[in-house]
């Protein structure tokens, strides 16, 4: 009898531990990636930022993958995605090619199965960075809640990448899973 | 036999209740702190904002502590941190000394064990607030996902604090725990 | 004896499944609503945006209701609310009535039981959109953590709605439940 009871208990324990693991104890995926300033592209047009840190300073990743400049989803779910992008210019860096700038960020999702890329979030501003001021700065923040499937890739594009602030507290993006897909 | 079964059941209940408590039912820490406008410091350089409400209007706190102008972490975990900072000037507000303003926010983490302070997030903009307009406004929003340890402190620094909008919907910061550290 | 044990197990299973359901397995409410550009109001003063998509493209909703331009809470809890609002003007759209603009967003909560409306979050900027540039753009992002009760309604107001960017990646708002109210 006692052995039977223990077997029943093991079944109960096992099932609910399994469920609890699936529910919350399974490490929820997340990433916080910070700009790798050693490899920022040049130009003023929209370019994809491919160099990000994932394991130094504030940068970290768990149950997601960073590869070829893209954040790859390993687990289906609803995720909150965010990006913070800072641009700056000091007169000691030399003259700007133009005082009228379009400082933008685009957070995009790429599906490998059906090769396609779509912008999930965008933000930014047109700015007039006049020579009357020796220093200019501008930051963009975007965030939103999206359904992501395993294998999908998140990337970040910006205009005027040469103006990016290279600090880890300034230019970063990330994601964290909030809940499963029903 | 019946007594034995009840004891086994109690063990099962106890263990999984304990786990469930650790998992999700344990109240996840959060805070949403709104600016206390009765005590905004002056200055043009970066100053720490130490007066925040934690228990009136939209302001609230749970399983975190607010002390000496800092939000103290009581529970290890990964948290989403955010701040919204609004600056404004009306011609009746006072004699603005410069049109060229650097309106910035810095969200910092201080570790008491290893006395050090580091900026987690920054945002803002340089602005030209001309006298040709009677009213000026600008808001900054930053957010990000960070690993925080018990005892660490989160604080907010801004430039030009006398330009802060004192409304609870305008100037606030907060945090909520998303998941445990593995 | 065996029947008794099964009954006990059913009790254990039942209670903890019920608790797990309440805890996390119950689908946590969320919404991500994108602007419906076919019905954007005109004017430069603060207006409520009532036309949003909830089931096309990135727009989605679960365990919340969208009705009469408002996002209705169906489940008490603490929610993270966010909004991203983009404004733009191209010279081909015609001349602006004024070059001095106040581009603002207000995320409000309305309680039906006690008829009242309160702003939870605001953001934006005054802008000088000069005729010297053919294109102007500006985005606002706000986010915060709030206690919401079943039946309460979330809505979004903006100034200068005719300048809104109608793209789904540009102008949206949303919410997701993070935790229960203790």
């Amino acid at each position: 009898g006692s052995q039977h009871i223990r077997a029943e208990k093991a079944m109960v324990d096992g099932s609910w531990l399994d469920l609890a693991k699936r529910s919350k104890l399974e490490a929820q995926p997340f990433a916080h990636l910070t700009i790798n300033a050693t490899d920022i592209p040049t130009g003023s047009h929209k370019v994809s930022l491919s160099s990000w840190y994932h394991d130094r300073g504030w940068a970290k990743i768990s149950n997601m993958t960073f590869s070829n400049g893209k954040l790859i989803v390993n687990q289906d779910g609803f995720y909150y995605l965010y990006a913070n992008i800072c641009f700056r210019h000091h007169e000691t860096s030399g003259d700007l090619a133009t005082e009228y700038l379009q400082l933008m960020v685009y957070v995009t999702k790429t599906s490998i199965k059906i090769p396609s890329s779509h912008t999930l979030m965008k933000g930014g501003s047109t700015k007039y960075w006049s020579g009357n001021s020796e220093f200019h700065f501008y930051s963009i923040n975007v965030g939103g809640f999206f359904k992501l499937r395993s294998g999908e890739e998140i990337s970040v594009e910006v205009s005027n990448p040469s103006l990016l602030d290279p600090d880890q507290d300034a230019t970063y993006f990330g994601a964290f899973k909030v809940r499963d897909i029903d | 036999g019946s007594q034995h079964i009840r004891a086994e059941k109690a063990m099962v209940d106890g263990s999984w209740l304990d786990l469930a408590k650790r998992s999700k039912l344990e109240a996840q820490p959060f805070a949403h702190l709104t600016i206390n406008a009765t005590d905004i410091p002056t200055g043009s350089h970066k100053v720490s904002l130490s007066s925040w409400y934690h228990d009136r209007g939209w302001a609230k706190i749970s399983n975190m502590t607010f002390s000496n102008g800092k939000l103290i972490v009581n529970q290890d975990g990964f948290y989403y941190l955010y701040a919204n900072i609004c600056f404004r000037h009306h011609e009746t507000s006072g004699d603005l000394a410069t049109e060229y303003l650097q309106l910035m926010v810095y969200v910092t983490k201080t570790s008491i064990k290893i006395p050090s302070s580091h900026t987690l997030m920054k945002g803002g903009s340089t602005k030209y607030w001309s006298g040709n307009s009677e009213f000026h406004f600008y808001s900054i929003n930053v957010g990000g996902f960070f690993k925080l340890r018990s005892g660490e402190e989160i604080s907010v620094e801004v430039s030009n604090p006398s330009l802060l909008d004192p409304d609870q919907d305008a100037t606030y910061f907060g945090a909520f725990k998303v998941r445990d550290i593995d | 004896g065996s029947q008794h044990i099964r009954a006990e197990k059913a009790m254990v299973d039942g209670s903890w499944l019920d608790l797990a359901k309440r805890s996390k397995l119950e689908a946590q409410p969320f919404a991500h609503l994108t602007i419906n550009a076919t019905d954007i109001p005109t004017g430069s003063h603060k207006v409520s945006l009532s036309s949003w998509y909830h089931d096309r493209g990135w727009a989605k909703i679960s365990n919340m209701t969208f009705s009469n331009g408002k996002l209705i809470v169906n489940q008490d809890g603490f929610y993270y609310l966010y909004a991203n609002i983009c404004f733009r003007h191209h010279e081909t759209s015609g001349d602006l009535a004024t070059e001095y603009l106040q581009l603002m967003v207000y995320v409000t909560k309305t309680s039906i039981k006690i008829p009242s409306s309160h702003t939870l979050m605001k953001g934006g900027s005054t802008k000088y959109w000069s005729g010297n540039s053919e294109f102007h753009f500006y985005s606002i992002n706000v986010g915060g953590f709030f206690k919401l009760r079943s039946g309460e309604e979330i809505s979004v107001e903006v100034s200068n709605p005719s300048l809104l960017d109608p793209d789904q990646d540009a102008t949206y708002f949303g919410a997701f439940k993070v935790r229960d109210i203790d």
């Epitope: - | 002056t42 200055g43 043009s44 000394a97 006398s162 | -």
Partner: antibody, heavy 122, light 107 residues
């Protein structure tokens, strides 16, 4: 060396006009708000006008509002005070003063010129 | 307008003495007070701002304190070169107003 040099003072009849100038050197003039402060013979200091760093904001006390106009030319590193409808009580040494960096709404003065004397008398 | 009342209007002290001047504002100005030194025939010089902060290059014998409406300026050990008139100024709200001055002389 940081320097402010006033000029343009002199004797003027009541109801007359005068334009004071202040030449700045040794610092980035365009970055600073500036003011004029006066001192009547044997009396204390009185602030009479201020101008923001970019020149789009101008400020006056009620005693001179509508009569005095402050302006600046950042390209020439120069500050001006146009004084109209002068009265006997406007007789004073007029100092050009640089507002120190600090809170954007607070004005105190870290660099002063030697002053120029304005006498209003018939 | 905020009125600034300075006292005394004049004082006489010996070299090495501790000298204290007070300034009273007609309303709360927090800590927005500056102190200036003006020697005869010269322009004023900034000594203290924000009630207690010494300006660059100002000797440590000069100090300031106070908040709200009552402020104190102190010369811890009077030196011959300190002979001057001292003015307080509120920098809290426009119009920026000065005290009437305190003339410091050597006995």
């Amino acid at each position: 060396e940081v320097q402010l040099v006033e000029s343009g003072g002199g004797l003027v009849k009541p109801g007359g006009s005068l334009r004071l100038s202040c030449a700045a050197s040794g610092f980035t003039f365009r970055n600073y708000a500036m003011s004029w402060v006066r001192q009547a013979p044997g009396k204390g200091l009185e602030w009479v006008s201020g101008i923001s760093s970019g020149g789009t904001y101008t400020y006056y006390p009620d005693t001179v509002k509508g009569r005095f106009t402050i302006s600046r030319d950042n390209a020439k590193n120069s500050l001006y005070l146009q004084m109209n409808s002068l009265r006997a009580e406007d007789t004073a040494v007029y100092y050009c003063a640089r507002r120190d960096y600090g809170d954007v709404y607070e004005w105190y003065f870290d660099v002063w010129g030697k002053g120029t004397t304005v006498t209003v008398s018939s | 307008d905020i009125q600034m009342t300075q006292s005394p209007s004049s004082l006489s002290a010996s070299v090495g003495d501790r000298v204290t001047i007070t300034c009273k504002a007609s309303q709360d100005v927090r800590t927005s007070i500056a102190w200036y030194q003006q020697k005869p025939g010269k322009a004023p010089k900034l000594l203290i701002y924000s009630a207690s902060y010494r300006y660059t290059g100002v000797p440590s014998r000069f100090s300031g304190s106070g908040s709200g409406t009552d402020f104190t300026f102190t010369i811890s050990s009077l030196q011959p070169e300190d002979i001057a008139t001292y003015y307080c100024q509120q920098h809290y709200s426009s119009p920026w107003t000065f005290g009437g001055g305190t003339k410091v002389e050597i006995k």
